[in-house]
């Protein structure tokens, strides 16, 4: 056993040691260890084949460390392996495409806070047992195609507290066991109509603190299977463009945030599921005509991104526009500091508690969000609680097979990882 | 700093109700995940319930099921801890606790970061 | 509900020693386990929470390990302030369940 270790075999052949101070993997690691714990020490690199003598391995936590590289064949030969903790190494930035290769029984990947930048191509390839995949709180900017598409059994997906500026067709594609995606705080404007096309048993969907200012419907008909939605905190344009998704939120039968309006004036601070549908008139078009807030691309229905019901019409040219505004006013979605650089609501009117990702209940109180920052092994962000409360419901006994969204979910506990020290 | 304030100690008699509270300061209630539990003199520490956010539910232990109840008053930030039908096995020291769980992150880790410091609640005749 | 069983229920050390309290579920809690260190008439503290990460300000001499069913906490050279109870809580479920304690003595 290494002499900063402990060893012991009952329940299971482990190597542990954390926090001590270890510069390097230690040498004379156990072969038949089937756990070991490196987390908390101050190891940078992780040469190849660092653990081939340990065939039997299947937890190895390398967490809270100060790694900068990680060979490619650093975790060769761990075919058994099954959860991985490479978080809280900021310094990492960038993660070979070939490290995770072979490792066919993971069903659990740290590489939140990390400090990526990307995802390089088939990083995740050959992963078919993987179920959790924390990817939060990086610096991720994009969504490759097909990055996830070896990952039919991933159930979870951790992708807040990114800068990812959008969400591609084939971004998703092969996610058809899904249950949970946290794409909340990052900065994502525009989601393609089919990105979400293989997401049939996806319950849970946060897209709260982005810059979104419209949601084509035809990326919400697949989730079948959606409970939980949360859209707080994007810039939303209230106009005629919207009255599609206000349809949608009419019919679903599940649990949304709100859905605040930014534009029109009129209507800002105002829930777009409580607006009549009469109050979505004509469009927002406050930038002039050529520079509509609407991203998507031009089509036969859109030509210059507009959508069909914001064209000019030779009978109707006033349709265009909010009634009683002129054309050339100033666009409040200017200029919109990304989440992230900003204070929270920063540019989508006043923030009120029930902006937290569990909305709120009609009638609950709404006193401002304070900016104090809780204990300091705590990133700031967004509540876990929101909607407030149903007292005296009976107990439950839910287990959060390994995450359990509550904290964004908690039938009672917490998941994922990251929280360092 | 967030800091969880509770009301001070005491003395009641054998099937009456006490409620006990707690004032968030440097947060909102809206925004927490408040928990509480209880600990007897020379004993261990005993979970009695607590708020789900998933579930948007208060949840309680089986143990006080029916006569423990958790409520909020947003308007103040106080959380309340009220336990009915005393009887002298309840005397106790009472912490109402702040889940870490947070929801950036994505990793809900539930222990209970910051408490309070008690209120002792005497049951005697 | 999960049982959590610890051991020792006791234990005395010297200043500067290594000591280990172990904590037992009575099933699967994967690595949703924390750790408290409570002080006579003062409220618990965390210290550790799923099962390796380390609270904001508590000293590097603590550290937590372990998943499943099995975990411990360790504290390198003791110091005096070290003299408390010791409890582990299972956070997987609702109820939250917690150890019995262990009470460290500083020789």
């Known amino acids: 056993c290494p002499g900063a270790c402990v060893c012991y075999n009952e329940p299971k052949v482990t190597t542990s040691c954390p926090q001590q101070g270890l510069q390097a993997v230690p040498v004379g690691i156990p072969a038949a260890s089937q756990r070991i714990f490196l987390h908390g020490n101050r190891i940078s690199h992780v040469p190849a084949a660092s653990f081939r003598a340990c065939r039997n391995l299947t937890i190895l936590w390398l967490h809270s460390n100060v790694l900068a590289r990680i060979d490619a064949a650093a975790f060769t030969g761990l075919a058994l392996l099954e959860q991985l903790d490479l978080s809280d190494n900021a310094q990492l930035r960038s993660v070979d495409p070939a490290t995770f290769h072979g490792l066919g029984r993971l069903h659990t990947l740290h590489l939140d806070r990390c400090g990526l930048q990307e995802l390089g191509p088939g990083l995740f390839r050959g992963l078919a047992a993987l179920q959790y995949l924390y990817l939060q709180d990086n610096a991720l900017q994009a969504l490759p195609d097909d990055t996830f598409r070896d990952l039919g059994n991933l159930t979870h997906l951790f992708l807040h507290g990114n800068r990812i500026s959008s969400v591609p067709e084939r971004a998703f594609r092969g996610l058809h066991s899904l249950d949970r995606l946290l794409l909340h705080q990052n900065r994502v404007a525009h989601v393609h109509p089919h990105a979400f096309r293989d997401l049939g048993r996806l319950m849970t969907l946060y897209l709260f603190a982005n810059n979104l200012s419209a949601l084509p419907t035809e990326a919400l008909a697949p989730l079948r299977a959606l409970q939980y939605l949360r859209l707080n905190d994007n810039p939303w344009v209230c106009d005629c463009r919207a009255r599609p998704l206000w349809a949608w939120l009419q019919k679903f039968r599940g649990s949304s945030s709100e859905v605040p309006c930014s534009l029109p004036q009129r209507l800002a601070g105002r829930d777009l599921k409580r607006l009549a549908a009469n109050d979505l008139q004509g469009c927002a078009v406050a930038t002039g005509p050529y520079h509509p807030i609407w991203t998507g691309r031009a089509t036969d229905e859109e030509p210059l991104g507009l959508p069909k019901c914001c064209q000019p019409d030779a009978a109707d040219k006033a349709s265009v526009l909010e009634p009683g505004r002129p054309a050339s006013a100033g666009n409040a979605l200017k200029g919109r500091v990304p989440p992230g650089d900003s204070p929270p609501g920063n540019g989508s009117g006043p923030r009120h508690i029930n902006d937290s990702p569990f909305g709120t209940l009609p009638g609950s109180a709404e006193p401002p969000l304070t900016a104090v920052r809780p204990e300091g092994s705590e990133p700031p962000g967004f509540p876990t609680s929101g909607p407030r409360r149903r007292p005296g419901c009976s107990r439950k006994n839910r287990t959060r097979s390994h995450c359990r969204l509550g904290q964004a979910g908690s039938g009672g506990g917490g998941t994922g990882d990251s929280e360092g020290s | 700093q967030m800091q969880l304030v509770q009301s001070g100690a005491e003395v009641k008699k054998p099937g009456a109700s006490v409620k006990v509270s707690c004032k968030v300061s440097g947060y909102t209630l809206s925004e927490l995940s408040i928990h509480w539990v209880r600990q007897a003199p020379g004993k261990g520490l005993e979970w009695m319930g607590g708020?789900?956010?998933?579930?948007?539910?208060?949840v309680y232990a089986q143990k006080f099921q029916g006569r423990v109840t958790l409520t909020d008053d947003t308007s103040t930030d106080t959380a309340y801890m009220e336990l009915s039908s005393l009887r002298s096995e309840d005397t106790a020291v009472y912490y109402c606790?702040?889940?870490?769980?947070?929801?950036?992150?994505?990793?809900?880790?539930?222990?209970?970061?910051?408490w309070g410091r008690g209120t002792m609640i005497t049951v005697s005749s | 509900d999960i049982q959590m069983t610890q051991s020792p229920s006791s234990v005395s050390a010297s200043v500067g020693d290594r000591v280990t309290i172990t904590c037992r579920a009575s099933q699967d809690i994967n690595r949703w386990l924390a750790w408290y260190q409570q002080k006579p008439g003062k409220a618990p503290k965390l210290l550790i929470y799923a099962a390796s990460r380390l609270q904001s300000g508590v000293p590097l001499r603590f550290s937590g390990s372990g998943s499943g069913t099995d975990f411990t906490l360790t504290i390198n050279s003791l110091q005096p302030e070290d003299s408390a109870t010791y409890y582990c809580q299972q956070t997987n479920n609702f109820p939250r369940t917690f150890g019995q304690g262990t009470r460290l003595e500083i020789k």
């Open positions: 606790a702040r889940d870490l769980g947070y929801l950036t992150s994505g990793n809900y880790y539930n222990a209970f970061g910051i």
């Open positions: 708020f789900d956010p998933e579930d948007d539910e208060t």
